[in-house]
């Protein structure tokens, strides 16, 4: 978002609306409130970065994120017998991704059409609220999952209803917290008509009267409370997890677990490095520059960082893959275009053959329907 120069004629933030008494020129409209952007921001808003690169990334995220998170949610809700805390957190993670990704066709169309929002104020607010809501939900559920993974290694106790209930309670608390912290995004006017470019932007330009200082304080608070603190918890959990796995005895099963844990750690680290850190850092820097200088020199970087933050919806399925046996099975079978039922039938026949031959050489753990927690 960049700061627009607000020149209000009626003290309202209605913009791009042709008033009953307004004069319409040959091909233009008379605006009631006008917002000006600086040339650099205008070049970003009309350039290939926002009209070509962004739609490509968002299309990839939509094409990958929608089916993978959709399948994950279905697996966690209907195909996982035991609802372990890890399953509960991953189901919520998948839901958060889906709620964000379903709006991407509008986002893609917006950027393809030169950053021109034609879908109305309400839809823009929903899109933005869900966009940030997803990012912060992902961070918090990822933190819960990471802490829970460590806890399981420290206390390898069996599944209990109490643990699942605690996980459900924590999940509900996270959704409530995210709903509360994103309220300003739903309340604030996000659509702004830019007469110079003849476009109505959604969140990319903010009116000056919406004190940029408030936006800086808002995103700084979120960066500290909903990014840095959870990031510290996640990092701590994984450092302790690595220590525990190093010191544990090395049999074939624990070696597999360790490899999977390392893959999970690398995936979460990649998510932080690609998605969460650049976006949170640039949100703060961008608004600080607007607050102090009236313009942002990192606008293009900020746009790219926010775009990359959506890749978490594509990276999350890898987390599910490394944590959940059920998701792993369904993902493999989906990619091989096989049904789980067919695989189970194959397993049964293989098992009967194995027992008849008194041989264990066919043993395969990859198709065992189990959930690691």
């Amino acid at each position: 978002t960049i700061q627009g120069t607000n020149r209000s004629s009626k003290g309202r933030s209605l913009i791009g609306k042709v008033d009953g008494t307004s004069h319409v020129t040959g091909k233009g409209v008379t605006v009631e409130t006008v917002f000006s952007v600086d040339e650099f921001s205008a070049s970003v808003l009309t350039g290939k970065l926002t009209t070509v690169f962004l739609p490509i990334v968002y299309t990839i995220v939509f094409v990958v994120g929608l089916p993978s998170n959709g399948m994950a949610l279905w697996v966690f809700l209907f195909r996982t017998k035991k609802k372990h805390p890890a399953v509960i957190y991953m189901a919520n993670l998948a839901l958060a991704d889906l709620l964000s990704v379903i709006w991407f066709p509008l986002k893609i169309a917006y950027h393809i059409h030169g950053n021109n929002w034609i879908y109305g104020e309400a839809l823009c607010n929903v899109l933005i609220g869900f966009f940030y809501g997803n990012m912060y939900c992902s961070i918090l559920f990822m933190t819960c999952l990471s802490v829970q993974r460590y806890w399981v290694i420290v206390n390898p106790m069996g599944h209990s209803r109490k643990k699942a209930n605690i996980a459900i309670g924590i999940s509900l608390a996270i959704w409530l917290l995210i709903l509360l912290v994103t309220i300003p995004l739903y309340v604030v006017k996000q659509t702004i008509f830019i007469p110079a470019l003849n476009i109505t932007t959604c969140h990319d330009v903010l009116p000056e009267q919406l004190l940029v200082g408030d936006m800086f304080n808002y995103f700084l608070s979120l960066a500290i409370g909903v990014f840095l603190f959870p990031a510290f918890l996640t990092a701590s959990a994984y450092v302790l997890m690595i220590r525990m796995l190093r010191s544990s005895a090395m049999d074939e099963n624990s070696e597999k677990k360790r490899k999977r844990a390392i893959k999970l750690i690398v995936t979460v680290l990649a998510m932080y490095l690609i998605c969460f850190t650049p976006s949170n850092l640039l949100l703060v820097v961008h608004y600080f520059l607007i607050k102090s200088q009236g313009q942002s020199h990192v606008y293009a970087l900020y746009i790219v960082a926010l775009c990359l933050s959506t890749l978490n919806s594509c990276i999350d399925p890898f987390v599910y893959y490394f944590v959940s046996h059920d998701f792993r099975d369904h993902a493999k079978n989906a990619l091989l275009c096989r049904s789980v039922r067919t695989v189970k039938q194959m397993q049964v026949s293989l098992t009967s053959k194995k027992h008849s031959r008194k041989s264990s050489s066919y043993s395969s753990s990859s198709t065992t329907v189990k959930t690691s927690y």
Partner: antibody, heavy 119, light 106 residues
Framework: QVQLVQSGAEVKKPGSSVKVSCKAS????????ISWVRQAPGQGLEWMGV???????YYAQKFQGRVTITADESTSTAYMELSSLRSEDTAVYYC?????????????WGQGTLVTVSS | EIVLTQSPATLSLSPGERATLSCRAS??????LDWYQQKPGQAPRLLIY???SRATGIPARFSGSGSGRDFTLTISSLEPEDFAVYYC????????FGGGTKVEIK
């Protein structure tokens, strides 16, 4: 070179309208905005309104409903029409070129058109 | 709307002297402030834009400074052709001009 040439002085009766023209040369009207500023005798400068290269317009609250800014790309001319004239509208009216972006000033000005409103 | 207050209203100086003109905004305009020079019977001429950037063809003796609410136009050594009225104008929120400072020969 960049030039803004305005129409000649006008004497108008109260209640009537005046239309001042501003012919641009050395640049394309479609790539720039034209702002209108007026200056009453012995007074300071007062911003009136603007027309962007794409035809969008915006007027100062004080003049809303009385001023209309238009442009004809084919003749590279911008127009400012002020209706319901009163004696206090007696002023020199200037057109000025603006790039249309926040970080740009009014870099070139017309020579001005004196409009006298008198009964 | 943002109000710009220029001071002093009149500045009486001799050629070769240093002129310091002040412009104060009623609220923060960041660096979005320009300075214009106007001679009798002429259109305003852009001197400084965005607080401190000199416009094309403007002599180095003209310099601008400030940001936020307080701005200054400095003419290091007045030339005979510099005696005129100087206006500041902000373009952060609306386009408004200051009342002007007349620089006259002492």
């Amino acid at each position: 070179q960049v030039q803004l040439v305005q129409s000649g002085a006008e004497v108008k009766k109260p209640g009537s309208s005046v239309k001042v023209s501003c012919k641009a040369s050395g640049f394309s009207l479609s790539s720039y905005a034209i702002s209108w500023v007026r200056q009453a005798p012995g007074q300071g400068l007062e911003w009136m309104g603007v027309i962007w290269g794409n035809g969008n317009t915006y007027y100062a609250q004080k003049f809303q409903g009385r001023v209309t800014i238009t442009a004809d790309e084919s003749t590279s001319t911008a127009y400012m029409e002020l209706s319901s004239l009163r004696s206090e509208d007696t002023a020199v009216y200037y057109c000025a070129r603006w790039r249309g972006y926040k970080d740009y000033p009014f870099d070139y000005w017309g020579q001005g058109t004196l409009v006298t409103v008198s009964s | 709307e943002i109000v710009l207050t220029q001071s002093p209203a009149t500045l009486s100086l001799s050629p070769g002297e240093r002129a310091t003109l002040s412009c104060r905004a009623s609220q923060n305009v960041y660096k979005w402030l320009d300075w214009y020079q106007q001679k009798p019977g002429q259109a305003p001429r852009l001197l400084i834009y965005n607080a401190y950037s000199r416009a094309t063809g403007i002599p180095a003796r003209f310099s601008g400074s400030g940001s936020g609410r307080d701005f200054t136009l400095t003419i290091s050594s007045l030339e005979p052709e510099d005696f005129a009225v100087y206006y500041c104008q902000q373009h952060n929120s609306g386009w408004t001009f200051g009342g002007g400072t007349k620089v006259e020969i002492k």
